[in-house]
């Protein structure tokens, strides 16, 4: 089966790599523009230069292209705790990240928020904090994990999942009380 191709892909596949088919004349293959530039005018004929212009400040193209406009540079989202790792250049978009001792949580493919890495108080670090994943904590006896923090079993209500983890602790407390009454 032949994979389905979009119109642009169909047109480009007629020409050798690094060239694209002239939109008004399908017998002409024009050279694509280098990254950092965009298509100002198609080549007038075979073997003639494509008119490519450099992207203006605040825009970029990261690969060879025949785009009529450069892409707008991304802005780091301060409200999401993001910081700029590297600024936008004509051939590379802005790179955003998080501060030290923070990790990225992706709410969607193109939206992340920075959160502080868990310190595992009342527990131990099972896996260290990574760029896109919080610390994984293992809680000490008498504590259970809630929202990645080790919380005392005294805060465990019967309706919560923690009852399984805290059950031995609860039984110990009952046992101590029982032995004290004899």
């Amino acid at each position: 089966l032949v994979p389905h191709l979009g119109d642009r892909e169909k047109r480009d596949s007629v020409c050798p790599q690094g060239k694209y088919i002239h939109p008004q004349n399908n017998s002409i293959c024009c050279t694509k523009c280098h990254k950092g530039t965009y298509l100002y005018n198609d080549c007038p004929g075979p073997g003639q230069d494509t008119d490519c212009r450099e992207c203006e400040s605040g825009s970029f193209t990261a690969s060879e292209n025949h785009l009529r406009h450069c892409l707008s540079c991304s802005k780091c989202r301060k409200e999401m705790g993001q910081v700029e790792i590297s600024s936008c250049t004509v051939d590379r978009d802005t790179v955003c990240g998080c501060r030290k001792n923070q990790y990225r949580h992706y709410w969607s493919e193109n939206l992340f928020q920075c959160f502080n890495c868990s310190l595992c108080l009342n527990g131990t670090v099972h896996l260290s904090c990574q760029e896109k994943q919080n610390t994984v904590c293992t809680c000490h006896a008498g504590f259970f994990l809630r929202e990645n923090e080790c919380v005392s079993c005294s805060n465990c209500k019967k309706s919560l999942e923690c009852t399984k983890l805290c059950l031995p602790q609860i039984e110990n407390v009952k046992g101590t009380e029982d032995s004290g009454t004899t």
Epitope: E79, H105, W107, F115, N134, E147
Partner: nanobody, 119 residues
Framework: EVQLLESGGGLVQPGGSLRLSCAAS????????MVWVRQAPGKGLEWVSH????????YYADSVEGRFTISRDNSKNTLYLQMNSLRAEDTAVYYC????????????RGQGTLVTVSS
Amino acid sequence: EVQLLESGGGLVQPGGSLRLSCAASGFTFAHETMVWVRQAPGKGLEWVSHIDRVGQDPYYADSVEGRFTISRDNSKNTLYLQMNSLRAEDTAVYYCALLPKRGPWFDYRGQGTLVTVSS
């Protein structure tokens, strides 16, 4: 006590419009980034849009870009979501929430308002 109360949902035909509102109380509304999330039947929460405290540079999910507009009125402690050119896939319960601070969960979220897009 933080309270978020959504309204404005209902049944609408494809291509139609709705305006959701979220009345906020119990915190300083003007200091918080506010979020709209939605949950379609049998699916997880999807981030729809958010707006910072002064209402600049709102974010939209690709699925709603160009059709939905988020806004806020800090004098009325109210968040809005104007939804145009509605599609069947926009059918969901829509929740307004405060931007999470401690971790990737919603400490403060409303009860939601149901939007059904159907002919």
